[in-house]
């Protein structure tokens, strides 16, 4: 009943709780002298399902057969309607539609830790939509039994609150769960187990790691476990990896030596425990321990390259460049690089430690034979030095690679190809492909990039530090013993027409012809490698097509003569620049009138 029902009653047959698909009869009856003016024909009883009218009857009672009710609770309310008055609530009832409980499945019990309590879980099966009570029963040796009830709507877990002890680890216990509601009951299959079957150890704790003599090869992992633990499994991985290394150990007694860790690497370690070889379950993994392994001296050798620049008749500038060792080769934090410069005949040597840079520039005499050695040092030692003899890398013309080409290869890549040198190609020991942004004036501060290629290769894909719409000066060196030959080319990964034309800064007259000088286009406006300049001229105020002169682009060139102008005629001149993608807009216009005599 949902209210006091003073005016009448609602009865439900066969029951307020019914099986899905059943029919119910709902009767609404007025109590004596509770109708409209005591005249039953005026009484109109209306039956509502929630807020919808579903039936009505004029008289003292209403009978309604209801079918097709959904799972769950449906509310029925009976109201009385009298002429010229609001409906009056008489009484109501809730009908609960559900199903009998299914047999609980997969009953399993566990005790977390040797001091924990026994708790069981099961699968309820489909929802009954009714109040369902679950009773969990545990029986053990000596006719001992424990029972626990659960009245939650969704009950699939109960804790007995009792602790099984290891005194008799082979004693059998049996658990069973029974579900009961108004429509029926069902019991699970019994689950029989021993102490060793159900005790799941607590995860290990207090995990530590020690490196004897600060060496990665002498590493021991320590931890604490519950007293009965027999087995452990360890897993560990570098912090940046997703794959675990796994080790199983028996009777470890809280320690294990690890032999395959990499130096200067942060690792994550976890440990799990088990009481018996084939009974019971593994504990959860412990909390992670993160620890960095000690450094070891670097392995591998630095990749070193250099460039020479002529200063004057007696001096030359040497710029050395080297690449960082990989993490696995550095095996620690590189503190400095040691550069040794030596004159081979006189034996003079100069050593310098470089920190924070991977390049070094010095000035040496042009005479003598010079060699350098570069090594990387961390807290444990130094890598083997890379030794190179300083030579004129482009001196041997017969060693120069032939037919060098540079073509765009997808986004921000350039494919460089070449043919072996004319001189015995088998003499080539390796090729080096070098590239740097092209800067007019040959700025030596521009970063240098290089890669090494085996002697049988005739192409290389360069992608490191390659930007779109930038022109690169690319050199291919063929090295053979203490000789080298080189060829160069300009290349870009992506190009478009330059954004502006050259700016003419001066026009001068020289013996009947003129010399035009211009400023280079800013690098960021060149939009790739320039191929040509064009100089245009036409008579001022003329509508004729301009004449033009096309000059191949050379980095250092910024002037050009023109000798086809008529004297005493005023001309307008301007310039454009071209890449493979097209021509720039006009640069500035300049007027000029040649003063020389006419022929």
């Amino acid at each position: 009943k949902i209210d006091a029902c003073k005016r009448g009653d609602v009865t439900v047959k066969p029951s307020h709780v019914i099986l899905l698909g059943s029919t119910v009869n709902i009767t609404c009856s007025l109590k004596p002298r509770q109708g409209c003016f005591h005249y039953s024909r005026r009484n109109k009883l209306i039956l509502y399902k929630f807020d919808r009218r579903i039936n009505f009857h004029h008289g003292h009672s209403l009978n309604s057969q209801v079918t097709g009710l959904p799972l769950g609770t449906t509310l029925f309310v009976c109201k009385l309607a009298c002429i010229n008055s609001d409906e009056i609530q008489i009484c109501g009832a809730e009908i609960f539609v559900g199903v009998a409980p299914e047999q609980p499945q997969n009953l399993s019990c566990i005790q977390k830790g040797e001091q924990g309590t026994v708790a069981c879980t099961w699968e309820r099966g489909r929802d009954t939509h009714l109040y369902t009570e679950y009773t969990l029963q545990l029986s053990g040796p000596k006719n001992l039994t424990w029972q626990k009830q659960c009245k939650d709507i969704y009950c699939d877990y109960l804790d007995f609150g009792i602790n099984l002890t290891p005194e008799s680890p082979e004693s059998n216990f049996t658990a069973k769960v029974t579900a009961v509601n108004s429509l029926g009951s069902s019991s699970s299959l019994p689950s029989t187990f021993t102490f060793l079957d159900i005790v799941r150890p607590l995860p290990p704790w207090d995990i530590r790691i020690k490196f004897q003599k600060a060496s990665v090869s002498r590493c021991t992992l320590y931890w604490r476990d519950e007293g009965l633990v027999l087995l452990n499994r360890l897993r560990y991985r570098p912090s940046n990896s997703r794959l675990w290394n796994m080790v199983n150990v028996t009777k470890a007694k809280g320690r294990h030596d690890l032999l395959d860790l990499k130096p200067f690497t942060e690792y994550e370690f976890q440990i799990s425990s088990k009481l018996h070889l084939y009974k019971g379950s593994w504990s959860d993994w412990s909390e992670s321990l993160r620890a960095q392994t000690p450094e070891e001296e670097p392995t591998g050798m630095l990749d070193v390259w250099y460039m020479k620049r002529h200063i004057d008749y007696s001096r030359q500038q040497i710029s050395l460049f080297w690449k960082n060792l990989s993490v696995s080769e550095a095996r620690g934090k590189i503190l400095h690089y040691q550069v040794t410069l030596q004159e081979l005949t006189g034996g003079k040597a100069m050593t310098q430690n470089i920190t924070g840079h991977t390049s070094w520039t010095t000035v040496i005499p042009r005479t003598g034979n010079w060699a350098v050695a570069v090594s990387a040092a961390n807290s444990k030692g130094s890598s083997l030095p890379t030794r190179i003899n300083i030579m004129n890398l482009c001196e041997a013309g017969l060693l120069a690679p032939r037919q060098v080409s540079a073509n765009s290869e997808g986004m921000d890549n350039i494919l460089v190809t070449w043919q072996p040198p004319r001189k015995d190609p088998s003499a080539v020991q390796e090729y080096v492909v070098e590239w740097r942004e092209l800067h007019p004036g040959g700025d030596t501060q521009v970063p240098l990039n290089w890669l090494r290629s085996r002697p049988y290769n005739v192409s290389a894909l360069i992608s490191e530090n390659i930007k779109s719409y930038i022109c690169y000066e690319i050199r291919v060196y063929a090295l053979s013993g203490d000789q080298g030959g080189c060829s160069s080319i300009l290349g870009n990964s992506k190009h478009k027409a330059p954004l502006s034309g050259p700016h003419i800064n001066a026009i001068t007259e020289e013996k009947g012809s003129i010399l035009i000088s211009w400023n280079s286009i800013p690098v960021q406006e060149q939009m790739g490698c320039l191929l040509h300049y064009r100089i245009y001229w036409k008579e001022r105020d003329s509508n004729s097509q301009p004449q033009l002169c096309e000059i191949p682009y050379r980095v250092s060139q910024n002037s050009h003569p023109i000798n086809s102008l008529q004297p005493r005629v005023t001309y307008v001149l301007w310039m454009t620049a071209l890449t493979a993608a097209g021509e720039s807009s006009h640069g500035n216009e300049r007027e000029f009138c040649l003063q020389g005599k006419a022929n």
């Epitope: 029919t23 399902k49 807020d51 919808r52 579903i54 009505f56 009857h57 009978n63 057969q65």
Partner: nanobody, 123 residues
């Protein structure tokens, strides 16, 4: 699935009579109170009459009281509406519906309603 099929409409002169029928299927007809509902051109749905699940009680809108009679035959799953003394304002399309589709006599057209039957009262 639930289906309701109305018939018996037509053109009739004022003061004339018509009998509408509704054939029901796909549900336990005898356990449901039923209604007749109409919709005049350009107007909303208007509840006309109802009969309870036993067929013993009936209810009518004030506009048709004394002129229309609702009845049912549970053996044949049929609902009827006898319309006498018809007036031009009774012109509408008539639908049969479950009573529960018209809570507080405001009707919602359910997906299983039929096409209705047209009644036109005109001289």
């Amino acid at each position: 699935q639930v289906q309701l099929q109305e018939s018996g409409g037509g053109l009739v002169q004022p003061g004339g009579s018509l009998r509408l029928s509704c054939a029901a299927s796909g549900f336990t007809f005898s356990t449901y109170a039923m209604s007749w509902v109409r919709q005049a051109p350009g107007k909303g749905l208007e509840w006309v009459s109802a009969v309870n699940s036993g067929g013993l009680s009936t209810d009518y809108a004030d506009s048709v009281e004394g002129r229309f009679t609702i009845s049912r035959d549970d053996a044949k799953n049929m609902l009827f509406l006898q319309m006498n003394r018809l007036k031009p304002e009774d012109t509408a399309r008539y639908y049969c519906a479950k009573y529960e589709d018209c809570s507080d006599y405001v009707c919602d057209r359910a997906g299983y309603w039929g096409q209705g039957t047209q009644v036109t009262v005109s001289s």
